[in-house]
């Protein structure tokens, strides 16, 4: 029988091994959300194993949504070009590996895994089912592959080869940034505050990435996005440390850990508070 029969119409054995995703959200179906905007975005298609375009409605949806094709590829694909033979270079972990365990505000009781920066190991925790942060993995293996160091202090992917040129920040690359700042935190810290669709008036905090501060807003009780924190401290912990202030064209104010050479830019014009 032909190999096409074995793999249906998706991909053949000779082309690629079965997909090993860098992030579980790459397996989500593209979700345009309930709103009616027409925004060109990209998602990773697990069947074609490629990043593809879709139209996003502007609210809700899921994390398999990227502003650019490049960002999608960096988050969800492992090209051969991104694999190199092990060298003495230490690869840096994605920023979200350093976020604290966050069960979120919902009341599910779901086993997930997070990277504990104190123990330098991936550990089990109970996730509530919504919000939280991206230091949250469906499987122990996925957490280890992304956040733990390999046996020689390397970060390794599923194939045992060192990840190279993976963009460790989660922010859009296609947009403009104030020259004084660089952002390296979770992508949802750049999203506008979103009240959601219900009728409650709960006190919450969102990260305003224009001014680099956490600000209060009224949450409706459902929907919205992940830039939504129950306390100012939680908001600052998740988002504030993503900003690094520049002191000159090439230099950075000293921080706890090295940053990628790749610079990430934030949208100045797209930041606003929705439904306020």
């Amino acid at each position: 029988d032909s190999e096409e029969d074995e793999e249906h119409t998706i991909i053949t054995d000779t082309e690629l091994p079965p997909l090993k995703l860098m992030h579980s959200f790459c397996a989500f179906k593209a979700d345009d959300g309930p709103c009616k905007a027409i925004m060109k975005r990209f998602f990773f298609n697990i069947f074609t194993r490629q990043c593809e375009e879709f139209i996003y409605g502007g609210c809700e949806g899921n994390q398999n949504r990227f502003e650019s094709l490049e960002e999608c590829k960096k988050m969800c694909t492992r090209d051969n070009a991104n694999r190199i033979i092990k060298t003495t270079l230490q690869q840096e972990k994605p920023d979200f590996c350093f976020l604290e365990e966050d069960p979120g505000i919902c009341r599910g009781y779901i086993t997930r895994y997070f990277y504990n920066n104190q123990t330098k190991q991936c550990e089990r925790f109970k996730y509530g089912g919504c919000l939280g942060n991206m230091n949250n993995f469906e499987t122990l293996e996925e957490c280890k592959n992304i956040c733990e160091d390999g046996p020689n202090g390397f970060q390794v992917d599923n194939y045992g080869t060192q990840l190279n040129a993976v963009n460790n920040s989660l922010t859009p690359q296609s947009t403009k940034v104030p020259s004084l700042f660089e952002f390296h935190g979770p992508s949802w810290c750049l999203t506008p505050a979103d009240r959601g669709l219900c009728r409650a008036n709960e006190n919450r905090f969102y990260y305003n990435s224009v001014i680099g501060k956490c600000r209060p807003f009224k949450y409706s009780g459902c929907g919205g996005n992940e830039n939504n924190f129950t306390s100012k401290q939680e908001c600052l912990r998740a988002c504030k440390k993503g900003f690094i202030q520049r002191i000159s064209k090439g230099g950075l104010i000293k921080t706890k850990r090295k940053r990628k050479k790749q610079r990430v830019k934030i949208a100045y014009e797209e930041i606003f508070v929705k439904n306020m």
């Epitope: 079965p18 997909l19 579980s24 397996a27 779901i110 499987t139």
Partner: antibody
Framework: QVQLVESGGGLVQPGGSLRLSCAAS????????MSWVRQAPGKGLEWVSS????????YYADSVKGRFTISRDNSKNTLYLQMNSLRAEDTAVYYC??????????????WGQGTLVTVSS | DIELTQPPSVSVAPGQTARISCSGD??????VYWYQQKPGQAPVLVIY??NRPSGIPERFSGSNSGNTATLTISGTQAEDEADYYC???????????FGGGTKLTVL
């Protein structure tokens, strides 16, 4: 040609144990997630358990958690389901199914013909 | 938790279009898969999302939006008589869910 052949089914008393096996051929077994899905007589399909290609992660339906254990031996191209503390409601045809890729979020694209497990005193 | 609800039975005349629904909360935001099972046989994947595996006739198609996914069989033939199951993966709880199944009768 992809082939999945289940074995190990049979009659067992409540509280007893059985070990099901699934011999795989016609594809690179070590590169695919695998699952067990069951079907009680005259009823619908129910997912039981999945295991990713490297064996490092396993997933179970609530109805079998703590009683069933899925495992695989990639060197033997074989998938297993160890069933302990069996109950009458575990009576079903048990299907071995290959998932379309490495992860347990892929759909089941090939199925075996099933093996019948009957739990009765 | 996802719950998928299917009608227990659907009848269609030969050559007509059969539509089998699968409803669940916001199911349109998830991948849905359809399996055909004939008596005494193992299930066969006939639709993944809105795609058809090779070897599945063109008369089978799938759509999914809002709270309902639909399997459509255009120009239904006698050989299409079978049980049909929808399925989806719950990425929050990491488990698979099947609908209760629909018996398609070709009159």
């Amino acid at each position: 040609q992809v082939q999945l052949v289940e074995s190990g089914g049979g009659l067992v008393q409540p509280g007893g144990s059985l070990r099901l096996s699934c011999a795989a051929s016609g594809f690179t077994f070590s590169r695919y997630a695998m699952s067990w899905v069951r079907q009680a007589p005259g009823k619908g399909l129910e997912w039981v358990s999945s295991i990713i290609s490297s064996s490092s992660e396993t997933y179970y339906a609530d109805s079998v958690k703590g009683r069933f254990t899925i495992s695989r031996d990639n060197s033997k191209n074989t998938l297993y389901l160890q069933m302990n503390s069996l109950r009458a409601e575990d009576t079903a045809v048990y299907y071995c199914a290959r998932l379309m890729g490495y992860g347990h979020y892929y759909p089941f694209d090939y199925w075996g013909q099933g093996t019948l497990v009957t739990v009765s005193s | 938790d996802i719950e998928l609800t299917q009608p227990p039975s659907v009848s269609v005349a030969p050559g007509q279009t059969a539509r089998i629904s699968c409803s669940g909360d916001k199911i349109g935001s998830k991948y849905v898969y359809w399996y055909q099972q004939k008596p005494g046989q193992a299930p066969v994947l006939v639709i993944y999302d809105s795609n058809r595996p090779s070897g599945i006739p063109e008369r089978f198609s799938g759509s999914n939006s809002g709270n309902t996914a639909t399997l459509t069989i255009s120009g239904t033939q006698a050989e299409d008589e079978a049980d049909y199951y929808c399925a989806s993966y719950d990425s929050i709880y990491s488990y698979w869910v099947f609908g209760g199944g629909t018996k398609l009768t070709v009159l």
